[in-house]
Every structure is written in C-alpha cells, then in structure tokens.
C-alpha cells in the first residue's frame, strides 16, 4: 500500500497525532458545514486536502474565496464551507507538516456527502415515482 | 504496526449485509476486535461488538436495519502492546425507494 | 454558560508530583477533546496532553513518560498527573474542552510552580 493509505499513532514527534471530527456528515445543498482538527499547534502548520474518492490522492484544497475559510485557535484547527454545492462532495484532510523533523501527519478524513437532487435526470426520476 | 486507511462510509440497502475489513500489516496472531460509536454520541468506551473473523479481521453484520448506523471502529493488539485504531467507517442504512402501489407499466399508466 | 473548574496546582520541588483536576459543567456527551495547556511568563500557551472521546492520548515531547492525561466520563473530569517535575514545568495550567461541533471552553488557570 502506498503510504498515505496507512497511518499509525506513532509515539515519536510531538505532531505525531491529528485528531479530526466528524467522520462523516450528510447535509442538504446550501447549508453550512464545519470540520475540526485537533493537534498540537506548536509543532507546525495546518493545511487542508481534499479527494473525491476513496482510492485517489488527496490534493490541496483550493479555498473559494467568501465561501470557504479555514481557521485556527491554538490547538483547534476549522474548515467552514458555506453554500455547500454537489463538487464539494469527498473526503476532507487536515494535514500537518512537523517544524523539527518535516514528516507530514493526517487526520482521518472528514466525508462530505451535499444531498438533494443534482440533475434533471434524477428529479424526474423523482416525479416519476411520485406519479 | 500500521492500520490502513478504511472507507469513510459505507451504504448498505435495508435487509444487506455489512462487510467491514480492518486492514492492518500484524501476523496472525494479532488480537482484531469490533466497536461501535453512535453519531454523535461521544460517550467512552464505545460499544463493544466482538471479535473480528478471518485473517484480515473482517466483521459481517447480516440483515442490516436502522438501528445498526454509527461508526464502526477496529482495534489491533499484538501481544501486551498497545492497540491501534482504525479511522471508522460511517455505516449509512439506505431504504429501499417504496414499490408504486400500481406496480404496472407506463403504457398501461397512460390508457 | 459552560465552567470548567481547575485545582490542584502549587509550590513543589523539583522531582515531586501534582495531580490537577478540571471538572467541566457539561455533558460528556458533548466532549470530543479533555486538554490541558500551558502558559509560562513570557511565552505562548502550549499543548501539554489531551484525550479524546475514543481515549486516545497526545503528549507535549517534554512531558512524555512523566506526565499522563486521563479522565472520568461520568464526572467530566479530565486529571493530569505530573511526576518527575521539572522548574522547567513552573507555568499557569489551563484546562480546555473542546465539544464535537468546535466550541471550545478554557478554565480560568491554576498555577504550578517547581522549585526548591
């Protein structure tokens, strides 16, 4: 497996351990969501990844400006996503880059699944049911 | 000892079975057991749900209904070590859409 | 409002023990994350060790194997027992709870102090 399939709770480095919440949220188009990470801020910075699907790699999460803000307060790291849209579907990383040793830690990953209908073809599937 | 990453989640229709892999690289007599969290609910120690089957700790829950959603967790001990836990995967039970009462054709719908 | 009350701080020698308690008047059902940080004259507040809903712990590299974080759900008390206390550890401690949607509470401090 490659390495960032696996993890482990190393007893090492001081940012050795990022702990993120929740696992998993569902929620409507358009409703604001947040996501946590907890860590020792003292050992470097926090960033945000994304990737759509399980099997991909994450990628850096491009923040859409007034829509999307990350923010720290010493140890508690937050990703709010307003307006939330069918793209913003997948799994959210936190991610910490060590300042003494440059090893980089994961949290688990935060999925988004944005609900309701995305297309035309669903929504008369829809209407068809309820016919 | 590494614990691979699991899905986030998972979706099973109503009255499916659930598989749950805990991917880890221990030999075989690693020690691989099954909890659950409720969403939401952060209470400690999670529920306890047994051990984990075949090599790869695989937990199977059959016949799943709405009670059984929440996070599943594995927990691998080799020896006296301390245990590693897997991220979770979010078990989400789909109901199956309702069968029209007049299950008939479209052609028959428009006469 | 949600108070976390501390004790246990105080004046020690270097290589004695404390233990500090931080009770939170809140649910435990709405805890993610029991912690306690630090503040010594002139610097920054700094993680010491946490605990979280699943138990798991983290830990400041200069208090590793000398301090250990743990917690009574029922009470929402979250303790830190120090050993092996250094002047180095002397700071105001501060317990922090953390809920599953972000809010965050600090106590008001309890002050540590190591010296002979």
């Known amino acids: 497996a490659r390495s960032e399939d696996r993890y482990r709770n190393p007893k090492g480095s001081a940012c050795s351990r990022i702990w993120q919440s929740p696992r998993f949220i569902a929620r409507k188009r358009g409703f604001t969501v947040k996501m946590h990470c907890y860590m020792n801020s003292a050992s470097g910075n926090v960033s945000w990844l994304w990737k759509q699907e399980m099997d991909e790699n994450p990628q850096q999460l491009k923040l859409e400006k007034g829509r999307m803000e990350e923010s720290q307060n010493e140890s508690l790291a937050t990703l709010t996503i307003q307006g939330i849209r069918f793209e913003d579907n997948g799994i959210y990383f936190c991610q910490q880059k060590c300042n003494n040793t440059s090893e980089v830690y994961q949290g688990c990953g935060t999925e988004l699944r944005v609900m309701g209908f995305s297309t035309l073809a669903q929504l008369k599937q829809r209407n068809t049911l309820k016919d | 000892l590494w614990m691979h990453k699991v899905p986030a989640s998972l979706m099973v229709s109503l009255g499916e079975d659930a598989h749950f892999q805990c991917p880890h690289n221990s030999s075989n007599n690693a020690n691989v057991t099954w909890w659950r969290v409720l969403h939401g609910n952060y209470t400690w120690p999670p529920e306890f749900l047994g051990p984990g089957e075949d090599p790869n700790g695989t937990l199977i829950i059959q016949n799943v209904n709405k009670s059984h959603g929440g996070i599943y967790v594995c927990r691998v001990q080799e020896g006296n070590e301390s245990y590693q836990q897997s991220c979770g995967t979010y078990l989400r039970v789909r109901q199956p859409p309702p069968r029209p009462f007049l299950d008939m054709g479209e052609g028959t719908k428009n006469r | 409002d949600v108070q976390l009350q501390e004790s246990g701080g105080g004046l020690v020698q270097p290589g004695g023990s404390l233990s500090l308690t931080c009770t939170a008047s809140?649910?435990?059902?709405?805890?993610?994350?029991r912690a306690w940080h630090r503040q010594a004259p002139g610097k920054q507040r700094e993680l010491v060790a946490a605990?979280?809903?699943?138990?798991?712990?983290m830990y400041a590299d200069s208090v590793k194997g000398r301090f250990t974080i743990s917690r009574d759900n029922a009470k929402t008390t979250v303790s830190l027992q120090m050993d092996s206390l250094k002047p180095e550890d002397t700071a105001v401690y501060y317990c922090?709870?953390?809920?599953?949607?972000?809010?965050?509470?600090w106590g008001q401090g309890t002050q540590v102090t190591v010296s002979s």
């Open positions: 922090n709870v953390v809920t599953p949607n972000g809010q965050q509470y």
């Open positions: 809140i649910s435990s059902l709405t805890i993610w994350v």
């Open positions: 605990i979280n809903s699943d138990g798991q712990t």
